[in-house]
């Protein structure tokens, strides 16, 4: 069963700043994310932000910045101008819509014992991003390899029979020892949730790669098409018809400005869905 997790945290640097993190755990691609406060969307809640994978993001005060973190999670930064900090007692809700499969919503609030200086809230995503971990892992392997080579050279210096070049077989063995851990670490990092299993993200779930950003495919047969396809797509006259994934639109020639990180297009790692849902009219 698909699930939505919500985490609210206070920024350690600015006590008046809050961040709401929401994520979708389950199959299917997201067509729209709505963040509201004071209750669920459509049931007394007030919209703070709406994020669409192609159309971008819209937000309302006190929301400061809404953005996609991965293809199935978002974050919303809030600026609390009031001294009384009303966010502390507020419920934030996130709704993930996957048209036409269904929509899922969950709510959360700031934990009562939220001292940003003392306790860190549970992180629903791995603390170490997969790409960063890969770089660090590779660096570690290389450093280990260099150290090992130096160790061998030092041992050879102290040998009575001076032999500057290691044998061919030794060289091969060294190469194998240097690169095998790298491949193992990369395999371990292939699923970013493999080693960090929080209450929000079971390791058994099919999870998205935080670094899996890429543009959507643009070939025919009901593939989603977005701003990234403009290079290979003829420029559309105002009022022409375009049919793409999960959004109605009217003036094809008047798309909203595509700016900011929330506009990065990304494929569904489970394969693109055959969905055409946006339309343009005169």
């Amino acid at each position: 069963t698909p699930e939505v997790w919500v985490q609210v945290q206070m920024e350690a640097t600015e006590l008046s700043s809050f961040t709401v993190h929401c994520g979708f755990l389950g199959p299917g691609s997201i067509s729209l994310v709505t963040v509201s406060w004071g209750g669920p969307d459509g049931a007394g809640g007030t919209k703070l932000a709406v994020l669409h994978p192609e159309l971008g993001t819209r937000q309302w005060a006190p929301a400061r910045q809404a953005r996609w973190e991965t293809q199935s999670s978002i974050s919303l930064a809030l600026e609390d101008s009031g001294a009384s900090s009303p966010f502390a007692n507020t419920t934030f809700c996130c709704k993930f819509a996957s048209f036409p499969e269904g929509s899922w919503e969950s709510c959360g609030s700031l934990p009562p014992s939220s001292d940003p200086g003392l306790s860190a809230p549970p992180t629903p995503v791995p603390i170490l991003r997969a790409d960063l971990a890969g770089i660090l892992g590779l660096s570690g392997v290389l450093l280990f390899g260099c150290g090992y080579l130096l160790h061998l050279l030092r041992r050879q210096k102290h040998r009575p029979t001076p032999r500057l070049q290691p044998s061919h077989t030794n060289s091969q063995a060294l190469t194998a020892q240097a690169w095998a851990p790298s491949q193992a670490s990369q395999a371990a990092l292939h699923d970013p949730y493999a080693t960090i299993n929080t209450s929000f993200c079971p390791a058994t779930l099919d999870t998205a790669h935080p670094n899996g950003w890429a543009s959507l495919p643009t070939h025919a047969a009901h593939q989603p098409q977005g701003p990234a396809a403009s290079a290979s797509t003829p420029i559309l006259a105002r009022g022409s018809f375009v049919s793409v994934e999960n959004g109605l639109y009217t003036q094809a020639g008047e798309r909203p400005p595509h700016t900011g990180p929330g506009l990065t297009l990304f494929p569904d790692c489970r394969g693109p869905r055959a969905v055409e849902g946006r339309f343009g009219v005169r």
Partner: nanobody, 121 residues
Framework: EVQLVESGGGLVQPGGSLRLSCAAS????????MGWFRQAPGKGLEGVAH???????RYVDSVKGRFTISRDNAKNSLYLQMNSLRAEDTAVYYC???????????????WGQGTMVTVSS
């Protein structure tokens, strides 16, 4: 909770007419854009028409002049009058409540279970 219930689908001969209705509840009806999507058998979803809170209708080219979208805020209902139906109009029709992106964008946020429209002789 937002609820959308479509009705009015059925079997009709080419050239015939149908009127789809959508009863909506659980949200502020007058402030959201609403529309109709359809999904033909074995095909992808396609936007058909939508109407904003200002009442201005918008249509996909393939249905212009044949389909008419309207909404009744007092009854919390959305309608799609379909005339001169063709075989290619055969599909499951979904009523959607959308979020308006700028002036021209309406992305589905909630939708109904759909109603089947079959155009066949």
């Amino acid at each position: 909770e937002v609820q959308l219930v479509e009705s009015g689908g059925g079997l009709v001969q080419p050239g015939g007419s149908l009127r789809l209705s959508c009863a909506a509840s659980g949200f502020t009806f007058s402030t959201d854009c609403m529309g109709w999507f359809r999904q033909a058998p074995g095909k992808g979803l396609e936007g058909v028409a939508h109407i904003d809170s200002d009442g201005i209708p918008r249509y996909v080219d393939s249905v212009k002049g044949r389909f008419t979208i309207s909404r009744d805020n007092a009854k919390n209902s959305l309608y799609l009058q379909m005339n001169s139906l063709r075989a290619e109009d055969t599909a499951v029709y979904y009523c959607v409540v959308g979020f308006k992106f700028d002036e021209d964008y309406c992305a589905p946020n909630d939708w109904g279970q759909g109603t089947m429209v079959t155009v066949s002789s």
